[in-house]
């Protein structure tokens, strides 16, 4: 019966205690994107820095080829910010001629790829119309939420237009996940 | 060997178990800002409410003089929202005369100051161009991510223009961090 | 004294260890909203999907009648994103006639209802002016922070205009909370 005081009655046997410092975690930061081919009708995925500066992966959470690989099943908080910047958006010029138009837009999607499912699953989407008149513009889209993920799942960040992503600073565009 | 069932094999000796309720945590809320001098080329730092209303600090996480002081090393989730509000931005008037212009902007930076490092480190930045025509405008910038912090690190929130920060409500502008 | 190595000296007796997988958690996703009456001077509350797709509730965190019910006292991270979409906002037409005007706006509030306080408490607010000229527009508002909640507290998400909420995809509009 020794040590029993460390196992209060509400603690389930099937969910063993584990040290917080032992949990899979990653924070990835932006790098300059190399143009790559991507599937038609699918937004291109960003690739990331995983070691330098503020970036890290730990406790079996690995980054490889645009994907964060989930090393154990559980509930994860997943987040990303992408900062976009561009010149005057097209729609504004059309608008000036008096013709309302579906605006240009910027979109970020955090996507899950699972072996057991043929289609990628969109976990989070941030999408915004951009109709700036006569100027350079820039703005972030932030996303974050909790998901039940399985060992072997892969996460990536897709964007509507890779050429609009601000890759200049690690604090502007980033991607992370941690086991709760 | 007694008590061994409470120490599953994946648990590392160097990362002791600890009660979640014992972890450093803080949620700070906005207060009216007193104009203070700040370093040239550095955005001014906000100061915060740490006790009243929704605000709290606990478990050795202390707030003092615009800084959250990190009391123990580990991985922290750090977040802030700043709501900005202003009158018509300058650039829109210039634009109306037909001259494209670099737009006004609003920026939030969560900054880390470390004794052992001369320069502050920008952990998170949210920056947005503002070109509103003929109106009062208001909008939030939200930031949040996970960072490996060291005991003694200090965190602050800097903004591009302190006079544009909406300090009227504790739910509009806030800053927090918690050990994972 | 056996098992003592699993109880480091900084661990408080009053805060028992507990398995992370045993903690209350929920991620709710958007559904089509049915028009309902709401209190005068109070923004309408959204209702949510709690079982299908990405949505789940677990460990005694229950969803019912627009509310997430907090099953045990503690510090929770609470978050929501609402994606809004609409046609040209009214203010832009007024502006075109040369009269500056308080802009249309979109607002999200995460609200706490507690039995010990007659007024709902606004935990988080994201509010943004919308003055889009001649176009359809869409954009998200994201919120997230940590709060000390009591057993029996109820959380809901209120919005300024339920008809502007994008209910088309579970990744665009969502609401969640988890015990830290």
């Amino acid at each position: 019966l020794k040590g029993q005081e460390f196992a209060p009655s509400h603690q389930q046997v099937y969910a063993p205690l584990r040290a917080d410092g032992d949990k899979p975690r990653a924070h990835l930061t932006v790098v300059r994107q190399t143009p790559t081919q991507h599937l038609k009708n699918q937004f291109p995925a960003l690739h990331w820095e995983h070691e330098l500066g503020l970036a890290f992966t730990k406790n079996r959470m690995n980054y490889t080829n645009k994907f964060l690989l989930i090393p154990e099943s559980g509930d994860y908080f997943v987040y990303s910010q992408v900062t976009f910047r561009g010149m005057t958006s097209e729609c504004s010029e059309i608008r000036q001629a008096g013709r309302p138009n579906k605006p240009d837009s910027i979109t970020v999607v955090i996507t899950k790829v699972t072996d057991s499912y043929p289609e990628p699953t969109q976990l989070l989407m941030g999408t915004k119309s951009v109709c700036e008149v006569g100027s350079n513009w820039f703005q972030p889209i932030y996303l974050g939420a909790m998901f039940s993920l399985q060992e072997g799942d892969k996460l990536m960040v897709n964007v509507s237009d890779i050429s609009l992503v601000d890759y200049t600073k690690e604090d502007k565009t980033f991607f992370g996940a941690f086991l709760l | 060997l007694k008590g061994q069932e409470f120490a599953p094999s994946h648990q590392q000796v160097y990362a002791p178990l600890r009660a979640d309720g014992d972890k450093p945590r803080a949620h700070l809320t906005v207060v009216r800002q007193t104009p203070t001098q700040h370093l040239k080329n550095q955005f001014p730092a906000l100061h915060w409410e740490h006790e009243l209303g929704l605000a709290f600090t606990k478990n050795r996480m202390n707030y003092t003089n615009k800084f959250l002081l990190i009391p123990e090393s580990g991985d922290y989730f750090v977040y802030s929202q700043v709501t900005f509000r202003g009158m018509t931005s300058e650039c829109s008037e210039i634009r109306q005369a037909g001259r494209p212009n670099k737009p006004d902007s609003i920026t939030v930076v969560i900054t880390k100051v470390t004794d052992s490092y001369p320069e502050p480190t920008q952990l998170l930045m949210g920056t947005k161009s503002v070109c509103e025509v003929g109106s009062n405008w208001f909008q939030p910038i939200y930031l949040g991510a996970m960072f490996s912090l060291q005991e003694g690190d200090k965190l602050m929130v800097n903004v591009s223009d302190i006079s544009l920060v909406d300090y009227t409500k504790e739910d509009k502008t806030f800053f927090g961090a918690f050990l994972l | 004294l056996k098992g003592q190595e699993f109880a480091p000296s900084h661990q408080q007796v009053y805060a028992p260890l507990r398995a992370d997988g045993d903690k209350p958690r929920a991620h709710l996703t958007v559904v089509r909203q049915t028009p309902t009456q709401h209190l005068k001077n109070q923004f309408p509350a959204l209702h949510w999907e709690h079982e299908l797709g990405l949505a789940f509730t677990k460990n005694r965190m229950n969803y019912t009648n627009k509310f997430l019910l907090i099953p045990e006292s503690g510090d929770y991270f609470v978050y929501s994103q609402v994606t809004f979409r609409g046609m040209t906002s009214e203010c832009s037409e007024i502006r075109q006639a040369g009269r500056p005007n308080k802009p249309d706006s979109i607002t999200v509030v995460i609200t706490k209802v507690t039995d010990s306080y007659p007024e709902p408490t606004q935990l988080l607010m994201g509010t943004k002016s919308v003055c889009e000229v001649g176009s359809n527009w869409f954009q998200p508002i994201y919120l997230g922070a940590m709060f000390s909640l009591q057993e029996g507290d109820k959380l809901m998400v209120n919005v300024s205009d339920i008809s502007l909420v994008d209910y088309t995809k579970e990744d665009k509009t969502f609401f969640g909370a988890f015990l830290l």
Epitope: - | - | L39, T64, N65, F67, L69, V113, Y117, P118, G152, K154
Partner: antibody, heavy 116, light 106 residues
Framework: QVQLQESGPGLVRPSQTLSLTCTVS????????MHWVRQRPGRGLEWMGR????????KYNPSLKSRVTITRDTSKNQVSLRLSSVTAADTAVYYC?????????WGQGSLVTVSS | DIQMTQSPSSLSASVGDRVTITCRAS?????MYWYQQKPGKAPKLLIY???NLASGVPSRFSGSGSGTDFTFTISSLQPEDIATYYC?????????FGQGTKVEIK
């Protein structure tokens, strides 16, 4: 118009179970919390317990916990109180009240006498 | 249980007088409520959260205090204020009331 109306027998025999219903109009009980409070003759107010109607989650005064049950019927917008094994000491005016999320409001009260 | 000690148990004052009632909790509480109860009527909430005036309540009523010591004040007593006043804490289980203060006109 917002109203809380307590109803039930005015006389209950000792050792029997006291049952009262609070019928609500003008608001949805699921948007708030519902309480029962009693006031014995010439005495102060005693909180008996509360229910969170959306979930049915209850909280009771420990001094009454073994005897009190609060339930709700959301379809009828009603909350009920049951107090078992009553004695003369349970003679009181019983009030239902709401709290949380909207201004507090009380019913007008229902006098229940325990007597043989 | 958190005990609420209210004083005085009764008082008599003239119209226009300032009336003060105190309530002491046996341990610190965050939310204090003050109710008014007229004979044969249900209690009516006057003050919540220690110092917030409930909707429709005249501004002559006020509350203050924090932790364990709370005060309820009627700045200028009116004839319609004849009633019994109760404090109540919402922190612990059970929620407990003070024993009441009966206010009469001299």
């Amino acid at each position: 118009q917002v109203q809380l109306q307590e109803s039930g027998p005015g006389l209950v025999r000792p050792s029997q179970t006291l049952s009262l219903t609070c019928t609500v109009s003008g608001f949805d009980i699921q948007d708030t919390y519902m309480h029962w409070v009693r006031q014995r003759p010439g005495r102060g107010l005693e909180w008996m317990g509360r229910i969170e109607p959306a979930s049915g989650h209850t909280k009771y005064n420990p001094s009454l916990k073994s005897r009190v049950t609060i339930t709700r019927d959301t379809s009828k917008n009603q909350v009920s109180l049951r107090l078992s094994s009553v004695t003369a000491a349970d003679t009181a005016v019983y009030y239902c009240a709401r709290s949380g999320g909207m201004p507090d409001m009380w019913g007008q009260g229902s006098l229940v006498t325990v007597s043989s | 249980d958190i005990q609420m000690t209210q004083s005085p148990s009764s008082l008599s004052a003239s119209v226009g007088d300032r009336v003060t009632i105190t309530c002491r909790a046996s341990q610190g509480v965050m939310y204090m409520y003050w109710y008014q109860q007229k004979p044969g009527k249900a209690p009516k909430l006057l003050i919540y959260g220690a110092s917030n005036l409930a909707s429709g309540v005249p501004s002559r009523f006020s509350g203050s205090g924090s932790g364990t010591d709370f005060t309820f004040t009627i700045s200028s007593l009116q004839p319609e204020d004849i009633a019994t006043y109760y404090c109540q804490q919402w922190e612990g289980n059970p929620r407990t009331f003070g024993q009441g203060t009966k206010v009469e006109i001299k």
